[in-house]
Interface confidence: low
């Protein structure tokens, strides 16, 4: 049986059940290399409290559809008196990066995971030439996820002091110059994740090979190497390589750009101080508030919730967007869709799409940006579920009793962007984390 998602085959992936201190290792095409789980385990469960291992999915007992992968085992489990077998079930959804498998829940018999990934899309529009896993778990099983830094087009310019060259990088994947043919990037070779531009020439100085690694809990490392044997004439016979170290800052701060810290014989060392390198619980919440010692800040957007069936309305030329954030009130136009953001076509109001659902909500505060994300909306033709990204800005003089109002700023590949000036986005900072 052919591998259902070949892009995901090259790596053993990890997911964590934080509540029960369990680490899962997942290899969807072969078996995980963990002796304690046996030679054919595709999903190996490591219980860190008891230091025991259990195979909860066998690579030989795999069944697949386009959106679901199931691994059975021969291990019995009791469920309401019937003799079931332990199994793992991975639901795949279209995403814009390779993404990460997320542990959802488990019963006594079934371990459930969800994975939003380019590999599950109906069209190849989000697929990279080369992409590697962009997250890690530290020794405390806390997730550090750099997926939000991945650019689907364009690249980051590295801050360096050399006026004759410009070094551009992407995070965990190659630079897509076709979707964003900026003048400087246009000459970058396909597949490069680190592109050195000198005048009108561009050179590949590194491609992603291995996934993100954790050095210490506040330092993550990504390494790029130039795969082709052909040496660059300005590298003194050395093969180019790029090492990017992502550093979680010791306290809350605005974002910085990547900085070149060392350069020798085409070996480039870059340091990037960014809160995305911090563990995800420091940055994100599933509710509309972020507070407590762990987050170093107090943010509460719940006063923006609308009651009594009213919604915020944002004009998007062809469409009107109805928003009801931080609550579970149905938007009238999007009845029974559980939408937090509802897209209605002006010329045909029967054409209604959920652009993100209220139970699929993430509030993120990172590098000084406060963002509310609603995902899991109605599918587009690519298979990607519509989502909305609302960027909040502090405005103590906002109208509408300080609440302000969302403004639609654009759409890219079924992701809808809004900005929202409101006094409730004014962040109160605490001390160190």
């Amino acid at each position: 049986q052919a591998a259902p998602f070949p892009e995901l085959c090259s790596y053993t992936w990890e997911a964590v059940d934080t509540k029960n201190n369990v680490l899962y290792k997942i290899n969807i095409c072969g078996s995980v290399d963990i002796v304690q789980c046996g030679p054919s385990s595709a999903v190996c469960m490591h219980d860190l409290k008891t230091r025991t291992y259990h195979s909860v999915g066998d690579s030989v007992l795999r069944s697949a559809t386009r959106s679901l992968l199931e691994f059975n085992t021969t291990v019995s489990c009791d469920q309401q008196g019937t003799n079931h077998r332990v199994q793992s079930s991975i639901a795949f959804l279209c995403g814009k990066t390779l993404g990460t498998p997320e542990f959802v829940t488990a019963t006594e018999c079934v371990h459930y995971f969800e994975w939003r990934t380019t590999a599950a899309c109906k069209k190849d529009i989000f697929k990279a030439n080369k992409e590697v896993p962009c997250y890690v778990f530290d020794e405390e099983l806390r997730k550090h996820d750099l997926n939000p830094l991945i650019k689907l087009s364009g690249a980051y310019l590295v801050d360096d002091s050399d006026p004759d060259t410009s070094l551009f990088i992407n995070v965990c994947r190659d630079i897509d110059t076709l979707r964003d043919p900026g003048s400087q990037l246009r000459a970058c070779p396909p597949g490069t994740a680190a592109c050195l531009v000198r005048g009108h020439q561009a050179f590949d100085v590194g491609q992603p090979r291995d996934g993100l690694k954790v050095v210490r809990k506040d330092r993550l490392v990504l390494s790029y190497v130039r795969e082709e044997a052909g040496k660059l004439d300005f590298c003194d016979g050395h093969s180019p390589a790029v090492t990017i170290t992502f550093v979680c800052p010791s306290e809350r701060r605005e974002g910085t750009i990547p900085k070149l810290t060392a350069k020798s014989n085409c070996r480039y060392e870059i340091e990037w101080i960014t809160e995305y390198a911090c563990h995800r619980d420091y940055l994100e919440s599933k509710t509309c508030s972020l507070s407590g010692e762990q987050q170093d800040v107090s943010i509460d957007l719940t006063p923006l919730a609308q009651s009594g069936g009213s919604s915020y309305i944002s004009d998007g030329k062809e469409y009107l967007f109805y928003l009801n954030v931080c609550g579970e009130t149905e938007i009238q136009f999007c009845n029974k869709k559980q939408a937090a953001v509802c897209q209605v076509k002006k010329s045909d109001t029967s054409q209604v799409k959920a652009a993100g659902r209220y139970h699929n909500q993430t509030l993120r505060y990172s590098d000084g940006d406060l963002t509310l994300i609603y995902f899991g909306g109605d599918e587009c033709s690519s298979g990607f579920q519509r989502m909305s990204v609302i960027n909040f800005r502090c405005n103590k003089t906002a109208g509408n009793d300080g609440k302000g109002t969302p403004v639609f700023t654009g759409e890219v590949d079924c992701t809808y962007f809004f900005t929202w000036d409101t006094e409730y986005a004014c962040v109160h900072h605490h001390h160190h984390h």
């Epitope: 059940d17 934080t18 509540k19 029960n20 201190n21 369990v22 409290k49 489990c77 829940t105 488990a106 019963t107 006594e108 371990h111």
Partner: nanobody
């Protein structure tokens, strides 16, 4: 006050059965992972069984097929049903609750003696 209280231990003949109980107070019981451990005289404490917060159960090889862990969320109690007991099962049995929020909480233990 957060505490766990074990009960149900005692003297039983080889091949016999016992049911241990562990009553929890002061915690949201269903959010916690529950473990049973035991410590035989002169030996290190060893893990026996786990009941994850969502119902997944795992057992040490030495008790697999003989012991069953279960819970009653309404009574805030976790149980260890022990069948086909052997002399080597003699130990003080402890229950433990753990969650991402709280430190691990241990009970005071209950003695199980398997002897003819």
């Amino acid at each position: 006050d957060v505490q766990l209280v074990e009960s149900g231990g005692g003297l039983v003949q080889p091949g016999g059965s016992l049911r241990l109980s562990c009553a929890a107070s002061g915690i949201i019981f269903s959010d916690n992972r529950m473990d049973w451990y035991r410590q035989a005289p002169g030996k290190q404490r060893e893990w026996v069984a786990t009941l994850a917060s969502y119902g997944w159960k795992t057992y040490a090889d030495s008790v697999k097929g003989r012991f069953t862990i279960s819970r009653d969320n309404a009574k805030n109690t976790v149980y260890l049903q022990m069948n086909s007991l052997r002399p080597e099962d003699t130990a003080v049995y402890y229950c433990k609750a753990s969650s991402p929020v709280l430190n691990d909480i241990w009970g005071q233990g209950t003695l199980v003696t398997v002897s003819s």
